[in-house]
């Protein structure tokens, strides 16, 4: 399980995965734009098993999933996506 926590750089992701995660295992996805002391965009997947995974924003699967979600943004999203900056 990949750990997610605050570091001195205020980035939350220490390690990132590029492995595909089926949607039925996902509770929600959090997108943290770069800024506030973290020089990179971060994507955090909160899973139904209560574990948390940082996903490489360059991973093909997450880019494809985000594109699908963007296309469906006018209707209810099957996977809640939260975009916010770290306070």
């Amino acid at each position: 399980v990949l750990e997610v926590y605050y570091t001195s750089l205020r980035c939350r992701c220490v390690q990132e995965s590029s492995v595909f995660i089926p949607r039925r295992f996902i509770d929600r996805i959090q997108i943290l734009p770069r800024g506030n002391g973290c020089p990179r965009k971060e994507i955090i997947v909160w899973k139904k098993n209560k574990s948390i995974v940082c996903v490489d924003p360059q991973a093909e699967w997450i880019q494809r999933m985000m594109e699908v979600l963007r296309k469906r943004s006018s209707s209810t999203l099957p996977v809640p996506v939260f975009k916010r900056k770290i306070p």
Partner: antibody, heavy 120, light 107 residues
């Protein structure tokens, strides 16, 4: 060492019922999704059903959901498949498999299977 | 349901050959594809997950690629112990579905 051992297979008449069991050892059974997959003689693999640890997410192959019921007992490290109204086409080797939902998200450990024969 | 069409259904190759198996999904499955190896009378073994990731202990001659609807499984240099049937499977959504299998034989 991870071990999944299926049991409960055998010969049953059409219309009959059977309950398969899968005993798990060497894994923290209560943390993982589990699946049943079957294979008819000389044929390919067919997914049957899956269940999550809390038993609140259960999915079936559409053609089987009216007759088959997947369940589990985390205290006994056991997975079950209740099969009712059995038909000749249900004859197969039935495998249980652990479905990793931590870092691979695939069926990474399989039992050796138990054979179900439906015949009069 | 998502159909997984695997080809060829059987193939014969020589030791040292490069072997390629393809799998086509009936709809986009992102990179949610695994490849399994099954030897007669045995349970399937996971080789590749997430389309291209080798499972622990799997030799480097096995590889996978693809995304969306088209996937490829390759054995770079066939070994005698690779004789088996290989299956692709999509785990993008339920019901999980398998390809029909490719039976690999030695020439």
């Amino acid at each position: 060492e991870v071990q999944l051992v299926e049991s409960g297979g055998g010969l049953v008449q059409p219309g009959g019922s059977l309950r398969l069991s899968c005993a798990a050892s060497g894994i923290d059974f209560s943390r993982y999704w589990m699946s049943w997959v079957r294979q008819a003689p000389g044929k390919g693999l067919e997914w049957v059903a899956e269940i999550n640890p809390e038993r609140n997410y259960i999915n079936y192959a559409p053609s089987l959901k009216d007759r088959f019921t997947i369940s589990r007992d985390n205290a006994k490290n056991s997975l079950y498949l209740q099969m009712n109204s059995l038909r000749a086409e249900d004859t197969a080797v039935y495998y249980c498999a652990r479905q990793d939902d931590y870092d691979k998200y695939a069926m990474d450990y399989w039992g050796q299977g138990t054979t179900v024969t439906v015949s009069s | 349901d998502i159909q997984m069409t695997q080809s060829p259904s059987s193939l014969s190759a020589s030791v040292g050959d490069r072997v390629t198996i393809t799998c086509k999904a009936s709809q986009d499955v992102n990179t949610g594809v695994t490849w399994y190896q099954q030897k007669p009378g045995k349970a399937p073994k996971l080789l590749i997950y997430s389309a291209s990731y080798r499972y622990t202990g799997v030799p480097s001659r096995f590889s996978g690629s693809g995304s969306g609807t088209d996937f490829t499984f390759t054995i770079s240099s066939l070994q005698p112990e690779d004789i088996a049937t290989y299956y692709c499977q999509q785990y993008y959504s339920t019901p999980l579905t398998f390809g029909g299998g490719t039976k690999l034989e030695i020439k």
